[in-house]
């Protein structure tokens, strides 16, 4: 796996342990928590990153209305089970044998149950809506400049192909970035929108996952873009299955 040869670190994932024990003395990096080898030329999967995080010491341009089936990650952090490719296993359970089904970004999409709960397949999240509110500025950002800058960020920093950035909406002070990626569209080697969104979320919170890179310095025509609130909505290819009790709560 590619990693910085000279000092043997993983540019795309600081939550790794690297050593020159790969073939021919090449640098090889393994994710904390899982010990899985990671490809340092691309983003690490969200599942492995969450696992590493849990193992670390504790310290008209109208805005889009999320659909009724949109999920928000209300459950927060948990120690996930990842498959050999680093993807989330469809069924997740905690130490007290409480289980639930998740989508491809690891967000719960069913009520919680016991060990008898079945999750037949990992349902793909094909549409992500990143909802940001920026801090007050002298004036509104120019929409096309903002659009270009956010597309540049996703392409250069996260190596996400621009075809997966469906739209950038702006109504001061709210910015919405829509990412779309169907199973049929995602080719081998393509960055997953879920992974890109997670790296972006961590960057926005000042918790960059990149090794030794400065934090995110977002500017639009030289004007700093400072985010004060982030909400991420996830839409799955198959709608989630929650009981009416939750839906009416």
């Amino acid at each position: 796996h590619t990693a910085a040869q000279d000092n043997c670190t993983c540019p795309t994932n600081k939550m790794t342990v690297c050593s020159p024990d790969g073939p021919g003395g090449r640098c090889q990096c393994r994710a904390l928590g899982s010990g899985m080898a990671v490809d340092c030329s691309t983003l690490t999967s969200k599942c492995l990153l969450l696992k590493a995080r849990m193992s670390a010491p504790k310290n008209a341009r109208t805005l889009v209305r999320p659909s009724e089936h949109a999920l928000v990650d209300n459950d927060g952090l948990y120690d996930p089970d990842c498959d050999p490719e680093g993807r989330f296993k469809a069924r997740q359970c905690n130490q007290t044998s409480v289980c639930w089904c998740v989508n491809s970004v690891g967000v719960r999409r069913t009520d919680k149950g016991d060990l008898s709960l079945r999750c037949d397949e990992l349902v793909r999240t094909h549409h992500i809506l990143i909802d940001l509110r920026h801090r007050p500025t002298a004036g509104a950002f120019n929409h096309s400049d903002l659009d270009a800058e956010l597309r540049r960020l996703f392409r250069e920093r996260y190596r996400l192909h621009p075809k997966f950035v469906a739209a950038v909406h702006y109504e001061q002070p709210t910015i919405q970035i829509e990412l779309r990626q169907n199973t049929s569209q995602k080719a081998a080697g393509d960055v997953d929108i879920g992974d890109a969104a997670y790296y972006f979320e961590r960057d926005i919170k000042g918790e960059s996952l990149f090794q030794g890179r400065g934090g995110l310095d977002l500017r639009v025509r030289g004007e700093p873009l400072q985010v004060e609130r982030t909400l991420i909505y996830y839409l799955d290819e198959i709608p989630p299955k929650f009981s009416m009790k939750r839906l009416t709560a």
Epitope: T2, P11, S41, R155, E156, R159, H161, P162, K163, A187
Partner: antibody, heavy 119, light 108 residues
Framework: QVQLQESGPGLVKPSGTLSLTCAVS?????????WSWVRQPPGKGLEWIGE???????NYNPSLKSRVTISVDKSKNQFSLKLNSVTAADTAVYYC????????????WGQGTLVTVSS | DIQMTQSPSTLSASVGDRVTITCRAS??????LAWYQQKPGKAPKLLIY???SLESGVPSRFRGSGSGTEFTLTISSLQPDDFATYYC??????????FGQGSRLEIK
């Protein structure tokens, strides 16, 4: 086998517009690739002009952005370059190239066409 | 812009020699670097991408290495066909994509 072929006038007058077309064969212009223009002044190095992928906005070298337009014609499987307000400094061999990856490295090139800016 | 600086600008070598060309980036570009070979009157030809991946059909005597800001292209045993100009290119940023100034490899 992917092939690219540039065509257009070899001589352009100063302050005029340079127009070139690149015909693509062996690949669909609508494929998951970037389509770029790169130029090389006589005896000098390579300079990236800009790129496009179908369905997306073109990106241009900031040093040329005010003068350049790149467009795609899907029906003819070709893409084009327009550079206006040309001067002698724009005299170069112009190459079209296919870009691979999220940001391009160039795996296929046209043979290049020399464009001279002179009155 | 990310500046790419190649050295040497010109080098003389003989058939069978091992030669190394260096490319430095003005800021870290990870491993997003490509190497090209260009012969007079011809278009550039891709040799290496992602700093060390050999393009299909390119002889294994060509080898790329490095990451961050410093990269090298090594030709292990020069063949008569290898005398040409070599360019590096960064594709970490597209605003803009930039090339090195070139390194001309000539027969000693």
């Amino acid at each position: 086998q992917v092939q690219l072929q540039e065509s257009g006038p070899g001589l352009v007058k100063p302050s005029g517009t340079l127009s070139l077309t690149c015909a693509v064969s062996g690949d669909s212009i609508s494929s998951n690739n970037w389509w770029s223009w790169v130029r090389q002044p006589p005896g000098k190095g390579l300079e990236w002009i800009g790129e496009i992928y179908p369905g997306g906005n073109p990106n241009y070298n900031p040093s040329l952005k005010s003068r350049v337009t790149i467009s795609v014609d899907k029906s003819k499987n070709q893409f084009s370059l327009k550079l206006n307000s040309v001067t002698a400094a724009d005299t170069a061999v112009y190459y079209c190239a296919r870009g691979s990856g999220v940001i391009s490295y160039f795996d296929y090139w046209g043979q290049g066409t020399l464009v001279t800016v002179s009155s | 812009d990310i500046q790419m600086t190649q050295s040497p600008s010109t080098l003389s070598a003989s058939v069978g020699d091992r030669v190394t060309i260096t490319c430095r980036a003005s800021q870290s570009i990870g491993h997003w670097l490509a190497w090209y070979q260009q012969k007079p009157g011809k278009a550039p030809k891709l040799l290496i991408y992602k700093a060390s991946s050999l393009e299909s059909g390119v002889p294994s005597r060509f080898r790329g290495s490095g990451s961050g800001t410093e990269f090298t292209l090594t030709i292990s045993s020069l063949q008569p066909d290898d005398f040409a100009t070599y360019y590096c290119q960064q594709y970490s940023s597209y605003s803009p994509i930039t090339f090195g100034q070139g390194s001309r490899l000539e027969i000693k």
